[in-house]
């Protein structure tokens, strides 16, 4: 996160860290807890690393440096990448992770509410992006979970800034005209959440941007409302009956 500040314990209890353990262990992506056994993240996090066994998912944590060999983590039972995601294109950048064992909810570990299907009418004015990603383009992973308040921008405005790319209605953009605040490398898959009527909702999944926090280059996020049918279909067909945190 560029231009952010330290988060507090329990402030973003749905935020998880997706880490890979090969020879060493490192944080690669963020994710959002959306049910006892489900995490929503970006499909591109799994490019080149599709093996379930190498992943460790840490929930209910604030500081990555607090993680030791004794820190509990979740393992992956199943990775469900959107069927239309292609490595060569970058559309449909969304994936579900089914955990091997359900998580108990606590003050520091609980799910984020999902938006209503096709939610286009809600005007979100209080939106935040969180993660342990770089604090500048040529930076490094941060220890303490960072947060930053960023306004949504219209898809029309976003398209003007990315003329070489197609900004679809299944994407949502956020950023300041002058730059300075944005997600960055390592924040991928993490949440863009907005507070509306006193409730936090998962509006976007951190996907991509041109550099980080550059002027007139907003961050691009996968629009969760556009994938509600897919999320419900996958979680229900796998669970029998899903236990999603939906506002409706």
């Amino acid at each position: 996160i560029v231009g952010g500040t330290n988060s507090s314990w329990g402030e973003w209890p749905w935020q998880v860290s997706l880490q890979v353990k090969l020879t060493a262990q490192r944080h690669l992506c963020g994710g959002s807890l959306i049910g006892h056994q489900w995490v929503l993240t970006a499909a591109h996090c799994f490019d080149g690393l599709p093996l379930q066994d190498v992943w460790r998912i840490y929930s209910g944590i604030l500081n990555l440096s607090d993680i030791t060999k004794d820190t509990p983590f979740s393992q992956i039972k199943e990775i469900i990448i959107h069927q239309n995601y292609k490595v060569s294109e970058g559309n449909h950048d969304i994936a579900l992770i089914k955990l091997q064992a359900p998580l108990n909810y606590t003050e520091f570990q609980k799910p984020i509410c999902l938006p209503s299907k096709g939610d286009t009418s809600t005007i979100y004015t209080n939106c935040w992006v969180t993660g342990w990603g770089f604090s500048k383009e040529k930076g490094e992973i941060q220890n303490i979970l960072q947060k930053v308040n960023i306004p949504l921008v219209t898809n029309e405005e976003c398209q003007k800034r990315y003329q070489d790319y197609k900004i679809t209605q299944r994407m949502v953009c956020a950023g300041y005209k002058e730059g300075g605040k944005d997600a960055c490398k390592g924040d991928s898959g993490g949440p863009l959440v907005c507070k509306h009527n006193g409730m936090w909702r998962l509006v976007g999944i951190t996907s991509w941007g041109e550099g980080c926090a550059r002027r007139e280059q907003p961050g691009v996020y996968t629009k969760v409302a556009e994938y509600m049918d897919w999320i419900l279909e996958k979680t229900q067909s796998s669970d029998g009956k899903a236990q999603m945190q939906s506002p409706a």
Epitope: D47, S88, E89, N91, K138, K166, K185, S188, W208, E210
Partner: antibody
Framework: EVQLLESGGGLVQPGGSLRLSCAAS????????MTWVRQAPGKGLEWVSY????????IYADSVKGRFTISRDNSKNTLYLQMNSLRAEDTAVYYC??????????????????WGQGTLVTVSS | DIQMTQSPGTLSLSPGERATLSCRTS???????LAWYQQTPGQAPRLLIY???SRATGIPDRFSGTGYGTDFTLTISRLEPEDYGTYYC?????????FGQGTRVEIK
């Protein structure tokens, strides 16, 4: 299976014109940025031009700017390169390539993931 | 323009040996925009590595890419007969997109 097939090459005199085509199949052509790359005999690869998926944005190498025009017809799944005022130094095998643009580490990746077999353009009197 | 300088110009190695090819850029290049291609005589180039370190589909794991900023490396851990040819690095970070002049890997 992704396939790119160039055509239109041949022998042309200096100052002459030629139009290359690249027929694409096996993927949704209108989703992809496309590019032309050339290779003079016995030399390395040189990027020539690219065009955005809609065709609305084009960029050229300085060596061909003002003489070459890249275009596309998404309804025909075809990429074109109109070459005017040809010079001897334009002699090369011309390849069309698909430009893949995925996402990695919250940034776009850009690379040429599929290439045609090439068409030879010879500029000589 | 970003200049790409590859070294060595030619590498003479025997099958089974390790090949290390270098690519230096004149300006900082985001790793995501650095690719390596292989070309054998009479053939079109073939994508090997994208994003500086990700292997393209169907590329064997003896090929690996590393690097950051201005220094990038392609390594072939054990040369196979089909690996002989010319290797090019290429950047798409800024237009004009540019290629290195190539490194020829020949049989010793």
């Amino acid at each position: 299976e992704v396939q790119l097939l160039e055509s239109g090459g041949g022998l042309v005199q200096p100052g002459g014109s030629l139009r290359l085509s690249c027929a694409a199949s096996g993927f949704t052509f209108s989703h992809y940025l496309m590019t032309w790359v050339r290779q003079a005999p016995g030399k390395g690869l040189e990027w020539v031009s690219y065009i955005s998926p809609s065709g609305g944005h084009t960029i050229y190498a300085d060596s061909v700017k003002g003489r070459f025009t890249i275009s596309r017809d998404n309804s025909k799944n075809t990429l074109y390169l109109q070459m005017n005022s040809l010079r001897a130094e334009d002699t090369a095998v011309y390849y069309c390539a698909r430009v893949a643009r995925g996402i990695a580490a919250r940034s776009r990746t850009v690379y040429f993931d599929h290439w045609g077999q090439g068409t030879l353009v010879t500029v000589s009197s | 323009d970003i200049q790409m300088t590859q070294s060595p110009g030619t590498l003479s190695l025997s099958p089974g040996e390790r090949a290390t090819l270098s690519c230096r850029t004149s300006q900082f290049v985001n790793s995501n925009y650095l690719a390596w291609y292989q070309q054998t005589p009479g053939q079109a180039p073939r994508l090997l590595i994208y994003g500086a370190s990700s292997r393209a589909t169907g590329i064997p794991d003896r090929f690996s890419g590393t690097g950051y900023g201005t220094d990038f490396t392609l390594t072939i851990s054990r040369l196979e007969p089909e690996d002989y040819g010319t290797y090019y690095c290429q950047q798409s970070s800024r237009t004009p997109w540019t290629f290195g002049q190539g490194t020829r890997v020949e049989i010793k």
